[in-house]
């Protein structure tokens, strides 16, 4: 049993039980993000509000397959991205050595049973280092002014709502803020314990071949949820080939 399986199982625990028979889940993503050329960025999605089992997560950029995390099999990184893409954290994907050409839409495609496929979209803008620095110098005072204005407006709105709605509470929920906190803390995406072998996990007959369409609709079933809890850590060993 493997690491990705544990992550998927843990995600399953967090999902609220809802009526089955229709696609009730929602994908939360980090939304629109920007990063500097040469840097790294974590792409992160989170499926919630469904009890469906996540069997596979595909990461795609426009029409190109970047990586697959399969509950049965593990990670497969597309050969053309193998030097710049790292699996994780969790079911996410880390893009390294960013270039301006990496700017664009990225999709996390969750294959689930019995719901089917959920897709999340992230837009990444890769900025030239100088542009990012130059932009930051001028944006700081502007952002400060904007923030102050927003605080005033928000306060006024809250007062008005409070007065008009009397004692009805106003709930403000920021998906992006949640995801950033989760990502920073990691515990939402990956336990802090040493990783057992197989973040996500193995084998031959999954999608990602030589020719043809880059989107695989078939994916393996998630099996044996609970055995993963007894999976032993390997300790501090270097890369090896599993023989059994």
């Amino acid at each position: 049993m493997r690491w990705c399986l544990l992550l998927i199982w843990a995600q399953g625990l967090r999902q609220a039980p809802l009526a089955s028979g229709m696609m009730t889940g929602t994908i939360e993503t980090t939304g629109n993000i920007s990063a500097e050329k040469g840097g790294s960025i974590i792409l992160q999605c989170h499926l919630s509000s469904t009890t469906a089992q996540v069997t596979q997560v595909n990461w795609e950029q426009q029409d190109q397959l970047l990586a697959i995390c399969n509950a049965d099999l593990g990670w497969h990184i597309s050969p053309s991205f193998k030097d710049r893409v790292a699996p994780g954290p969790g079911l996410g994907l880390t893009l390294q050595s960013l270039t301006v050409n990496d700017t664009g839409e990225y999709f996390c495609i969750y294959h689930t049973y019995p719901d089917g496929t959920y897709t999340g979209r992230i837009f990444l803008e890769v900025l030239e280092s100088s542009v990012a620095e130059h932009g930051a110098r001028f944006q700081i005072p502007l952002l400060g002014a904007m923030a102050a204005t927003l605080v005033v407006i928000c306060t006024a709105v809250i007062v008005v709502v409070a007065l008009t709605r009397k004692k009805k509470a106003l709930r403000i929920h920021s998906v992006e803020g949640d995801l950033r906190r989760k990502s920073a803390g990691q515990e939402e995406w990956s336990p802090s314990a040493p990783s057992p072998p197989g973040s996500c996990v193995q084998a031959e007959a999954a999608p990602a071949g030589l020719c043809g369409e880059q989107r695989g609709e078939d994916c393996a079933e998630l099996h044996d949820y609970f055995n993963v809890l007894s999976y032993r850590s390997l300790g501090n060993c270097s890369f090896f080939t599993e023989t059994g």
Epitope: G88, S199, E204, A205, G209
Partner: antibody, heavy 127, light 110 residues
């Protein structure tokens, strides 16, 4: 030593059935996807079917869809291929093969290829 | 007809370097993983290369895999008589949901 041993081949009439078995040893069978690949006399390799470790995701070549059924018994470390409605063109040596996986401390990666093959079993469909 | 196209035959003299190509008849080969297999006469196939260019343990470094554009290649340097065999490329095909093999290349050592 990692080994795959096929059995169950033989002579069968067109329209008949046959069940091939592949006994695996030397590795944790339940962790790996497995495939059947065949080779007609004097011809090239033709992939037939594959099954994921848990047995829930299965793939078939168009030429055998609806006639062949792949299955596995992880408790017996055995892969099966049930072949029904056999045709003369199904005559071939049938190999079972194990998928590739490598693991690091934190991740296992799967690749597209078969790193261990059995010796093959001959299936002849003829009247 | 196979989705992967290989030359039916190739030849070389001992010590020479030979290259066998495997081209994709449809989309770009770049995003997909190629494996290479050797089949000596009367034996089961053996994996030579996986994930485009990786050699399993036990495969001599005379064998190497590469990929460029719409074609993958298997190179054999320092050719030996025991390299005389059939060579197949293979890959998973998304559109077919199937593993596909090239038609095979018969290598003759002159």
């Amino acid at each position: 030593e990692v080994q795959l041993l096929e059995s169950g081949g033989g002579l069968v009439q067109p329209g008949g059935s046959l069940r091939l078995s592949c006994a695996a040893s030397g590795f944790t069978f339940s962790n790996y996807a497995m495939s059947w690949v065949r080779q007609a006399p004097g011809k090239g390799l033709e992939w037939v079917s594959a099954i994921y470790p848990g047995g829930g995701s299965i793939y078939y070549a168009d030429s055998v869809k609806g006639r062949f059924t792949i299955s596995r018994d992880n408790s017996k470390n055995t892969l099966y291929l049930q072949m029904n409605s056999l045709r003369a063109e199904d005559t071939a040596v049938y190999y079972c093969a194990k998928a590739i996986r490598t693991c690091s401390l934190s991740h296992c990666y799967y690749y597209y290829g078969m790193d261990v093959w059995g010796q093959g079993t001959l299936v002849t469909v003829s009247s | 007809q196979s989705v992967l196209t290989q030359p039916p035959s190739a030849s070389g003299t001992p010590g020479q370097r030979v290259t066998i190509s495997c081209s994709c008849s449809s989309s770009n080969i770049g995003n997909n993983a190629v494996s290479w297999y050797q089949q000596l006469p009367g034996t089961a196939p053996k994996l030579l290369i996986y994930y485009d260019s990786n050699r399993p343990s036990g495969v001599p470094d005379r064998f190497s895999g590469s990929k460029s554009g719409t074609s993958a290649s298997l190179a054999i340097s320092g050719l030996r008589s025991e390299d005389e065999a059939d060579y197949y490329c293979g890959s998973w095909d998304y559109s077919l949901s199937a593993y596909v093999f090239g038609g095979g290349t018969k290598l003759t050592v002159l």
